[in-house]
């Protein structure tokens, strides 16, 4: 017997927002939260907020981490509050870059 | 070069079952969304799903939830669409598309397949 | 369901001319929306996503505008090759839906 396929209950989740995309609010609302790290011009970049569509934060999520970049991606309210994303290299930090919060 | 090469024809009768494959080249097919589609003839687009290859989500629109069943074997970067209980109504042609992130759309699409339901 | 509405059904033109076809969103969609070309027996072709930005290797003479529910897609300049049908897509929410497509035809 074939399994039963799961019914999709498609929703939006209010996420933490952090960056430039985010103007002047500090939240979104979208069907996935995220948290990004990235490298640019020799800072740490850290950004949170929300994919909108389901299908773009899959894609984006399921790009794995690379040297210069990471986000990490959940499903649910405030889920990405306490989630910092990491680069793949545990404990050490790349030469000539600093911590910088894009606010 | 991306290509999605579609398999033949098919002509099947009522209430029979019908699997279709799409086959990858120049890409792996766990890196994108492999999405379906149908087009009856003189007829619109329908969108059926999609499936993630990677870890096998599925999205189904409703119209198709009891129809479709998209699988995949990444093995042999194939994926498939399989149509049950089939009636006049499924005779059309079944778009594969691949979904990417750089226009997050259907980018590349197969050259199709014909299905044919009459007994 | 995001019902999509798009005008006119068909449409002649001459060589040369411009053609403006329109996409209704029964809710807002963002800029969410892909308009695709498909000659017969041929799979749809991607000419334009996120309403307004051009796929790569179209030509410039097909352009997308809009935002939220209405939206427009325009050819300059037909050429021969144009004459095909054209359809708009929304991908924000599931189940993903098209337009009833616009079937352009030689004057």
């Known amino acids: 017997v074939e399994d039963e396929k799961p019914k999709v209950n498609q929703k939006l989740y209010m996420c933490v927002c952090e960056g430039l995309s985010c103007g002047n609010e500090d939240h979104c609302e979208g069907q996935q939260c995220f948290s990004s790290l990235s490298i640019n011009d020799g800072f740490h970049v850290y950004q949170k907020g929300c994919f909108q569509v389901y299908e773009q934060g899959k894609m984006t999520c399921k790009t794995p981490p690379s040297p210069g970049q990471a986000v990490e991606c959940c499903q649910g309210d405030w889920c990405n509050r306490n989630i910092t994303a990491q680069l793949p290299t545990k404990g050490k930090s790349f030469p000539g870059t600093q911590n910088f919060h894009l606010e | 070069e991306v290509q999605l090469q579609q398999s033949g024809a098919e002509l099947v009768r009522p209430g029979a079952s019908v699997r279709l494959s799409c086959t990858a080249s120049g890409f792996n097919i766990k890196d994108s969304l492999m999405h379906w589609v149908k087009q009856r003839p003189e007829q619109g687009l329908e969108w059926i799903g999609w499936?993630?290859?990677?870890?096998?989500?599925?999205r189904y629109a409703p119209n198709f939830q009891d129809k479709a069943t998209i699988t995949a074997v990444t093995s042999s970067n194939t994926a498939y669409l399989q149509l049950s209980s089939l009636t006049s109504e499924d005779s059309a042609i079944y778009y594969c598309?691949?979904?990417?992130?750089?226009?997050?759309?259907?980018?590349?699409w197969g050259q199709g397949t014909s299905v044919t339901v009459s007994s | 369901d995001i019902q999509m509405t798009q005008s006119p059904a068909s449409q002649s033109a001459s060589l040369g001319e411009s053609v403006t076809f329109t996409c209704l969103a029964s809710?807002?969609?963002?800029?969410?929306l892909a308009w695709y070309q498909q000659k017969p027996g041929k799979s749809p072709q991607l000419l334009i996503y996120?309403?307004?930005s051009l796929a790569d290797g179209v030509p410039s003479r097909f352009s997308g505008s809009g935002s939220g529910t209405k939206f427009s897609f325009k050819i300059s300049s037909l050429q021969a090759e144009d004459f095909a049908s054209y359809y708009c897509q929304q991908l924000y929410w599931t189940p993903w839906t098209f337009g009833g497509g616009t079937k352009l035809e030689i004057k």
């Open positions: 996120a309403a307004t």
């Open positions: 809710q807002t969609i963002g800029t969410w």
């Open positions: 598309a691949r979904y990417t992130s750089r226009y997050y759309t259907m980018e590349y």
């Open positions: 499936i993630d290859p990677e870890d096998g989500e599925t």
